[in-house]
Structures are given as structure tokens and as C-alpha cells.
């Protein structure tokens, strides 16, 4: 597993470093999760040919993965810090069930999958501290999540490989958009 944020070996080059600010810590946490996703994607791509599948073919899946839209206030035009932060936190909470699904999908990267899941929980906590309007954040229904998880795990092998690939790709894209938006806050 990669080195957790705050223990980055690269930091050695910067002595007398002040403690990380909240924004820097969040930035670093996202980078850490992206590293984990990268490792998981490597295993997925080595195992199947999903990574070569065209975006059009992949778009036909029926997964309801979180995605940034104009109305979420995370883009430059119509940027709204509060609306956007709510979207990021809500999106990450929605991704949690999919990250749970990933837990039994990896052989050599099992530890990495767990690290991505746990690091995302930490990221959510960081962001919740930053949010002023926590009431606007809707937590996914546990019963709905449980039945979704059962449904995903009951798919055939090909669909499970496809689902794994889609989750990793969508999560990476969501984090990249979140990273840019958070730098605007």
C-alpha cells in the first residue's frame, strides 16, 4: 500500500515545513486515493480487456455512478462553493457502496482496495468539517445500498469486470473534478 498522506517521502526535501493546512491535507488525501485507484486499474486492465472498451459501449451500463453536472456549481461558470461542496460530499457518500463492492474484486491488490475505501472515508470526514450546511447532504439509504450490492455481486463474470472498470474510471473522474473545485474554495 502507498504511504498515507502526511508521510510522503518527498516531503523530506522540504525541511522546517509548517503543518499542512486543511486545503493541503484534502489535496494530499485525494492524491493518495488517486494513487490507489491507479494501482487497482493496473490490475483490472491486466486481467481483462475492459480498459480498451470504447466510452460509448461503456456508457450503456445501468450503473448510477455520481458525476459532476453544470447544476452542481463545481464548474467555473456558475461556481457555487456551498452547492459544490454538498455535491462532492454527497457524491463520495454515494460512491461508498461501489467501493464496498470493489473489496472482493482484487487478488494481488486487496490491501490497496481497502486503502482506497478507508481513505475515502477520511476524505469525507475532512470535507464534512469544511461544510457549513451539513443538513443539505443526503446520506444514501443503507437498505437500498445493501440490495444494490447484492445485485452487483450476482452479475456474471464479464459484467462484474465491466462494473469494476466503470467504478474505478468514474471515481477517478469524480475525484479530478472535485480536486479542481476544492482548489477554488
Amino acid at each position: 500500500a502507498p504511504v498515507p498522506p502526511g508521510e510522503d517521502s518527498k516531503d523530506v526535501a522540504a525541511p522546517h515545513r509548517q503543518p499542512l493546512t486543511s486545503s493541503e491535507r484534502i489535496d494530499k488525501q485525494i492524491r493518495y486515493i488517486l494513487d490507489g485507484i491507479s494501482a487497482l486499474r493496473k490490475e483490472t486492465c491486466n486481467k481483462s480487456n475492459m480498459c480498451e472498451s470504447s466510452k460509448e459501449a461503456l456508457a450503456e451500463n445501468n450503473l448510477n455512478l455520481p458525476k459532476m453536472a453544470e447544476k452542481d456549481g463545481c464548474f467555473q461558470s456558475g461556481f457555487n462553493e456551498e452547492t459544490c461542496l454538498v455535491k462532492i460530499i454527497t457524491g463520495l457518500l454515494e460512491f461508498e457502496v461501489y467501493l464496498e463492492y470493489l473489496q472482493n474484486r482484487f487478488e494481488s491488490s486487496e490491501e490497496q482496495a481497502r486503502a482506497v475505501q478507508m481513505s475515502t472515508k477520511v476524505l469525507i470526514q475532512f470535507l464534512q468539517k469544511k461544510a457549513k450546511n451539513l443538513d443539505a447532504i443526503t446520506t444514501p439509504d443503507p437498505t437500498t445500498n445493501a440490495s444494490l450490492l447484492t445485485k452487483l455481486q450476482a452479475q456474471n463474470q464479464w459484467l462484474q469486470d465491466m462494473t469494476t472498470h466503470l467504478i474505478l474510471r468514474s471515481f477517478k473522474e469524480f475525484l479530478q473534478s472535485s480536486l479542481r473545485a476544492l482548489r477554488q474554495m
Epitope: 492524491r31 488517486l34 491507479s38 461558470s77 479530478q176 482548489r183
Partner: antibody
């Protein structure tokens, strides 16, 4: 190999509109985290960032020139275009396009310009 | 508006010497947005350091970056003849991503 090449007129008259094109190869601007910016440098002076366009077509401009600038892209041609209206002699500079730093292994992007074009000199004079 | 101050404006040094360039800003900036560039006469700038202390691809180990808050440094441990150039620091301020560049430090042969 990643490359960026700027093209446009060497000379424009005051009040005219400048159109610059950045043609790139070796990467796709649709890749998550990818971004191309325009930066200029008047002769003997420091660098000045102008505009940026991101992987999902989100656009950013330097506040002082926002009303004069338009950045756009053509992903099929691998090009980014900058339009700057109402040119003035103070806009005489070398104009560069640059790709933002992205760690290709994980898609993490840093706010730094990793790869630059060679630049194109634009003189504003009547 | 945040202003980046680079010092000194010019530095006269001999090859083999250790050089430390300073970049100071009027407000505290994020370490994830501080970068250093090298520009030789008639050429485009080249990224040396990003995120305060990470060396860009292909940059020799003699270049290192550090600092936090309002004070950042670029150190060249032992100056090579090809290192004589102008060095710029840059960072991002609000509204994001407003890139601000310093005025540059010229490193010339003594």
C-alpha cells in the same frame, strides 16, 4: 512525445482581434486532469498567465483581461484557440501555450506548466 | 492582490557554487501550487519543481525546492555551466487558477 506548437499572425494592428492556435500532439485534452493554458511574456519582462481550458471544457481567465479573452478547443484537431480582442501595443509579447503538469500514472494534476510550446512573437503596431 | 517577490534580482556566481533563490509572497499560499521554472535566453520556460518540492521529469537532483507559508526556496547544490539562466517562481491565487509569476532571478557567471 508530447509537443505543443503555437501559430498566429506576427503583426496585428491596434484595436484588431488576435487569434492564436496551439496545435498539440502526444496527449488528449479529453483525458481527466489534462489542461492547456496560454501564457505571454512581453520583451524583457516576466511571464503572465492568460487563460486555461480543461479536460471537460471548463474555462478560466486572468481577471484583468477576462472581457477580452476567449479560449476554446477542437479535440478532433488537437487544437486550443485563444482569441484576444481590442489589441494594444502593450500586448506585444511572445505568446506560449503550455500543458499543465499531470502525473500520467494516477491522473493527479499540479498547478504547474509541465510542457511548453516554443512560443510565437506577436507585435502590435500600426 | 498577492505579489510574488523574488530575490535577489541578479546573482553573479561561479560554476560549482551552491545557490539558493528566494520567492516570497505577500500572503500565505498552498504548497501544492508553488512551482519553479528555468528560462534561457530565446527559449521557452522549463518546469523544474512543482508542488514546492517535487522535481519535474528529467530534472537533475542538484535542483531542490522547499519552504512553506510565505517563503519558498529553490536550491542548486552545485552550479553547472548550463544552469545560467533566469529562474521564475509561480503559484496560484484566488480566483483559482490565477497563476502569478515572480519577476525572476537572473543567475549569471561571475
Amino acid at each position: 512525445e508530447v509537443q505543443l506548437v503555437e501559430s498566429g499572425p506576427a503583426l496585428v494592428k491596434p484595436t484588431q482581434t488576435l487569434t492564436l492556435t496551439c496545435t498539440f500532439s502526444g496527449f488528449s485534452l479529453s483525458t481527466g486532469g489534462m489542461s492547456v493554458s496560454w501564457i505571454r511574456q512581453p520583451p524583457g519582462k516576466a511571464l503572465e498567465w492568460l487563460a486555461r481550458i480543461d479536460w471537460d471544457d471548463d474555462k478560466f481567465y486572468t481577471p484583468s483581461l477576462k472581457t477580452r479573452l476567449t479560449i476554446s478547443r477542437d479535440t478532433s484537431k488537437n487544437q486550443v484557440v485563444l482569441i484576444m480582442t481590442n489589441m494594444d501595443p502593450v500586448d506585444t509579447a511572445t505568446y506560449y501555450c503550455a500543458r499543465m503538469h499531470i502525473d500520467d500514472s494516477n491522473g493527479y494534476f499540479s498547478d504547474a506548466f509541465h510542457i511548453w510550446g516554443q512560443g510565437t512573437m506577436v507585435t502590435v503596431s500600426s | 492582490e498577492i505579489v510574488l517577490t523574488q530575490s535577489p534580482a541578479t546573482l553573479s556566481v561561479s560554476p560549482g557554487e551552491r545557490v539558493t533563490l528566494s520567492c516570497r509572497d505577500s500572503q500565505s499560499v498552498s504548497s501544492t501550487s508553488l512551482a519553479w521554472y528555468q528560462q534561457k535566453s530565446g527559449q521557452a520556460p522549463r518546469l523544474l519543481i512543482y508542488d514546492t518540492s517535487n522535481r519535474a521529469t528529467g530534472i537533475p537532483a542538484r535542483f531542490s525546492g522547499g519552504g512553506s507559508g510565505t517563503d519558498f526556496t529553490l536550491t542548486i547544490s552545485s552550479l553547472e555551466p548550463e544552469d545560467f539562466a533566469v529562474y521564475y517562481c509561480s503559484f496560484v491565487s484566488r480566483p483559482y487558477p490565477r497563476f502569478t509569476f515572480g519577476q525572476g532571478t537572473k543567475v549569471e557567471i561571475k
